[in-house]
């Protein structure tokens, strides 16, 4: 899988994980989250070549077509796979509001 | 839905379907494939500019950190969202064989 | 990291049998042909056969019918190739080596074990 | 069953180009993959479905397939080339796989 355990450990130029801190209010202008300040959000970058961790026939077909074609702008993106949510303390006047954000944290990759 | 009936009747620069017709034998190398010789592969491209068909609150939060941090490399990415299968004739020594290829032709897109 | 660890050397009588492991990690297993090539010293390579892991099924090379069974074992991810009624002549470095599973083995073997060599000799 | 034919030997001086042939009756309807095995190892895929190559082998490497022929270029040749290289195709008459020969390249000097 391209998680932490095999991204983080390998200097990956192909689809992989990639750290990425988030400041909510610094990188989102985000100032209604009181906690956490920010959080290990990650994300995916990275070349997907033939049969890199495709993620459907479609994208198998399409970076085969674009190792033959290279001049073609056609071709499959490294994107996130497994996400997981993040919990979060936020105010609606002075009642405290814990909450759960789904899908805020990707934990590993494809290529689709 | 970002599918043909929108992005192939309008000019758009975001994330959209796209046209893509794949020809076997000389796009893919494929030779094996009797019937069809080709087909409409179709494939998403196009820029994901803050709330434009997001997938997930990640996507969502990336687009809004891409906005704010335009220098930074994290960004969502245009990529397939329904897809269908074809159905290919292909012989085994004199015999032919019928099968669906699952997952094949791209119908919609997202941003991921 | 996407890899084929083969067992050790065997050394071997004319007669016997030898069993040769291929462990796969870093990869669907299910989701790629198996394929077994040999090389004779000084020789080329030589396919003997293929095993679809995900159901499988094999198909041999003809020299081989009836001397070579494939397996699998898909919770370990291993997969075997066992030669029987052994011959000098089958004396060879035994290669692993995978391929994407589509309808048909026509794609490349983008990824091979090490090698096992096996010796048969009295 | 299906037959692929390549020349034992190529030599080459560095620098310059080599040219390895793989000839079958109707070739050009078959996808070829090339491999190179270096002395003592394992093969290393260079060229699949006759003209794609994997990432991480240089653009020195190319290849072409028509009719009865495949051939692998190698361009401004190194040292680091000398090897065996082997053709390979699926041949769907017979669900067979099948490998050419092999041909020993030798960098000269």
């Known amino acids: 899988a391209l998680d932490a355990a095999y991204c983080f450990r390998n200097v990956q130029d192909n689809c992989c994980l990639r750290p990425l801190y988030i400041d909510f209010k610094r990188d989102l202008g985000w100032k209604w989250i009181h906690e956490p300040k920010g959080y290990n959000a990650n994300f995916c970058a990275g070349a997907c070549p033939y049969l890199w961790s495709s993620d459907t026939q479609h994208s198998r077909v399409l970076s085969l077509y674009n190792t033959i074609n290279p001049e073609a702008s056609a071709s499959p993106c490294c994107v996130s796979q497994d996400l997981e949510p993040l919990t979060i303390l936020y105010y609606i006047g002075k009642t405290p509001k814990i909450e759960q954000l789904s899908n805020m944290i990707v934990k590993s990759c494809k290529c689709s | 839905a970002l599918d043909a009936a929108y992005c192939f009747r309008n000019v758009q620069d975001n994330c959209c379907l796209r046209p893509l017709y794949i020809d076997f034998k000389r796009d893919l190398g494929w030779k094996w494939i009797h019937e069809p010789k080709g087909y409409n592969a179709n494939f998403c491209a196009g820029a994901c500019p803050y709330l434009w068909s997001s997938d997930t609150q990640h996507s969502r939060v990336l687009s809004l950190y891409n906005t704010i941090n335009p220098e930074a490399s994290a960004s969502p990415c245009c990529v397939s969202q329904d897809l269908e299968p074809l159905t290919i004739l292909y012989y085994i020594g004199k015999t032919p064989k019928i099968e669906q290829l699952s997952n094949m032709i791209v119908k919609s897109c997202k941003c991921s | 990291q996407v890899q084929l660890v083969q067992s050790g050397a065997e050394v071997k009588k004319p007669g016997a049998s030898v069993k040769v492991s291929c462990k796969a990690s870093g990869y669907t297993f299910t989701g790629y042909y198996m394929h077994w090539v040999r090389q004779a010293p000084g020789q080329g390579l030589e396919w003997m056969g293929w095993?679809?892991?995900?159901?499988?099924?094999?198909n041999y090379a003809q020299k081989f019918q009836g001397r070579v069974t494939m397996t699998r074992d898909t919770s370990i991810s291993t997969a075997y190739m066992e030669l029987s009624r052994l011959r000098s002549d089958d004396t060879a470095v035994y290669y692993c080596?995978?391929?994407?599973?589509?309808?048909?083995?026509?794609?490349?073997?983008?990824?091979w074990g090490q090698g096992t060599m096996v010796t048969v000799s009295s | 069953s299906y037959v692929l034919t390549q020349p034992p030997s190529v030599s080459v001086a560095p620098g310059k180009t080599a040219r390895i042939t793989c000839g079958g009756n109707n070739i050009g309807f078959r996808s070829v993959h090339w491999y190179q095995q270096k002395s003592g190892q394992a093969p290393v895929l260079v060229i699949y479905?006759?003209?794609a190559r994997p990432s991480g082998i240089p653009e020195r490497f190319s290849a072409s397939n028509s009719e009865n022929t495949a051939t692998l270029t190698i361009r401004r040749v190194e040292a680091g080339d000398e090897a065996d290289y082997y053709c390979?195709?699926?041949?769907?008459?017979?669900?067979?796989?099948?490998f050419g020969g092999g041909t020993q390249l030798t960098v000269l000097g």
């Open positions: 479905f006759d003209r």
């Open positions: 390979q195709v699926w041949d769907s008459d017979s669900d067979d796989l099948v």
């Open positions: 095993i679809n892991p995900n159901t499988g099924g094999t």
């Open positions: 080596a995978r391929s994407f599973l589509w309808l048909v083995p026509s794609d490349a073997f983008d990824i």
